[in-house]
Interface confidence: low
């Protein structure tokens, strides 16, 4: 009589996280009598996954009806696979006894779990920076397996090269994390720009995951000021305008000073937007010349986004 063989036909099985894994096992004989058990790992520390005879294994179902007469298929399906389920699974035939004794083991099936990386999260600097400055962006993605992963950085579709990437942990693990820091030089045209972190992994079937950061949340473009005197609107009245150009974000407060004394303060409201995303704004001041004996120094002082004020002055000649 030929001795019972335990056949595990698959040396390895690769499953995506969340899927069910089917682990195949057939025996060539019904003798000896005794249950099939499935273990993860070998040796004294092996973990019981399924016991045909007893126990409650909510994630495990048998592919065939194991209680059916003459059943020799003891393949199991393990539901909702996670990276923690990775390992080598052994189908083991036990011989009836008290206790049951191990009779023969299959060669084992190595289960590897393909876990998708989490959506990359891109974060920028805590404080805004001005053009020509270099800022750092970080990108993080977690929970992927296997370890091999590719991360790229882009700014407006152009690949960046100045970045450093680490995959942790260095040794074997059920899942891994990636952390990358990229350096980006800001330009005045970056209000509409995006920084994109792209992660490619075997689980993504050629469709990389992307995380984005809008440079509008990072950049501060300081305004340029121009103060001009308009033609006299009425006798003894001069209109002076302060053009505030190319600033971002919109948060801006303007103060007019006459000979160093505050005349009026206003907040930018009805701004116009430039194609590059920056804003322009204009404020004007009507100066009653007859109220002044001497020349008047008019100053347009602008506080932008909480930064130290910048100003531009204009000397208004008062004829004797």
């Amino acid at each position: 009589e030929e001795e019972l063989q335990v056949i595990q036909p698959d040396k390895s099985v690769s499953v995506a996280a969340g899927e069910s894994a089917i682990l195949h096992c057939t025996v060539t004989s019904l003798i000896p009598v005794g249950p099939i058990q499935w273990f993860r790992g070998a040796g004294p520390a092996r973990e019981l996954i399924y016991n045909q005879k007893e126990g409650h294994f909510p994630r495990v179902t048998t592919v065939s009806e194991s209680t059916k007469r003459e059943n020799m298929d003891f393949s199991i399906s393990i539901s909702n696979i996670t990276p923690a389920d990775a390992g080598t699974y052994y189908c083991v035939k036990f011989r009836k006894g008290s206790p049951d004794t191990e009779f023969k083991s299959g060669a084992g099936t190595e289960l590897s779990v393909r876990a998708k990386p989490s959506a990359p999260v891109v974060s920028g600097p805590a404080a805004r920076a001005t053009p020509q400055h270099t800022v750092s962006f970080t990108c993080e993605s977690h929970g992927f397996s296997p370890r091999d992963i590719t991360l790229k950085w882009f700014k407006n579709g152009n690949e960046l090269s100045d970045f450093q990437t680490n995959v942790d942990p260095v040794g074997e693990s059920v899942s891994y994390s990636i952390h990358s820091t990229a350096k980006v030089v800001l330009t005045r045209e970056d209000v509409h720009s995006q920084v994109i972190c792209e992660v490619a992994h075997v689980t993504l079937q050629g469709d990389p995951l992307r995380g984005t950061a809008n440079l509008s949340e990072t950049i501060r473009v300081p305004p340029t000021l121009e103060v001009t005197q308009q033609p006299v609107r009425a006798e003894n009245q001069v209109n002076v305008t302060c053009q505030v150009r190319k600033f971002y974000p919109q948060r801006l407060q303007l103060t007019w000073l006459e000979n160093g004394n505050v005349s009026r303060t206003e907040t930018a409201s009805t701004v116009t937007e430039n194609k590059d995303g920056t804003y322009n704004w204009m404020s004007w001041l009507l100066v009653n010349v007859s109220a002044h004996r001497d020349d008047v120094k008019l100053t347009c002082q602008v506080e932008h986004d909480g930064q130290p004020a910048v100003s531009k002055s204009h000397d208004l000649k008062v004829s004797a």
């Epitope: 995506a16 969340g18 899927e19 069910s20 539901s79 909702n80 994109i196 079937q205 469709d207 992307r210 995380g211 984005t212």
Partner: antibody, heavy 115, light 111 residues
């Protein structure tokens, strides 16, 4: 809360058309928008989903010919190289499937591809 | 791609009847529960009834229920109402993002 499609109409085979789907009462920023079509007298057919950011995906038959995009208030479906079998009512719906089901639907816009 | 097979394709029933529609996926749906049911009336857009196989959508009467896991799913209407005469579609999603397929539909008509 509603979605309103527009842009449908008669187009010749090989032509192009861009459908719009305007949202009111909610922002599309944090939602996927899916396009579903229904040929006259036929069942529903998933076309594709425009996710958050730059992520989009399409039914295998739609890849290459159909391209989706969206802003916070409007989603678009650009259709090229149209064929007579693309004749259908096109619906947009909020959602990306699974735990984000298609819960709000537009009224549909009819696209007729004929010479 | 995942294939969703609905049965029956049509049925005739009376008000008050219990109606069951099944939907079978060619492979396990994503997470074993990526299955939604939609109702469509003539000239109207579809309406979400059930998602995640068994979760009732907001505002949907409790006479609608969904069950099933993996590849086999069921929509049950416990007591058919006049407004329930419509076509019902299941929508299943595979493990790939770009793998969402509707069943062919089940038309529920007045007997």
């Amino acid at each position: 809360r509603q979605l309103v499609e527009s842009g449908g109409g008669l187009v010749q085979p090989g032509g192009s058309l861009r459908l719009s789907c305007a949202a009111s009462g909610f922002s599309l920023s944090s939602h996927g928008i899916s396009w579903v079509r229904q040929a006259p007298g036929k069942g529903l057919e998933w076309v594709g989903t425009i996710g958050t950011g730059v992520i989009t995906y399409y039914a295998s038959w739609a890849k290459g010919r159909f391209t989706g995009s969206k802003t916070s208030s409007t989603a678009y479906l650009q259709m090229t190289s149209l064929r007579s079998e693309d004749t259908a009512v096109y619906y947009c719906a909020r959602g990306s499937a699974w735990n984000d089901p298609f819960d709000y639907w537009g009224q549909g816009t009819l696209v007729t591809v004929s010479s | 791609d995942i294939v969703m097979t609905q049965s029956p394709s049509s049925l005739s029933a009376s008000v008050g009847d219990r109606v069951t529609i099944t939907c079978q996926a060619s492979q396990s749906v994503y997470g074993n529960n990526d299955l939604a049911w939609y109702q469509q009336k003539p000239g109207q857009a579809p309406k979400l009834l059930i998602y995640l196989a068994s979760t009732l959508a907001t505002g949907v009467p409790s006479r609608f229920s969904g069950s099933g896991s993996g590849t086999d799913f069921t929509l049950t209407i416990s007591s058919l109402q006049p407004e329930d005469f419509a076509t019902y579609y299941c929508l299943g999603g595979g493990d790939d993002e770009a793998d969402n397929t509707f069943g062919q539909g089940t038309k529920v008509e007045i007997k």
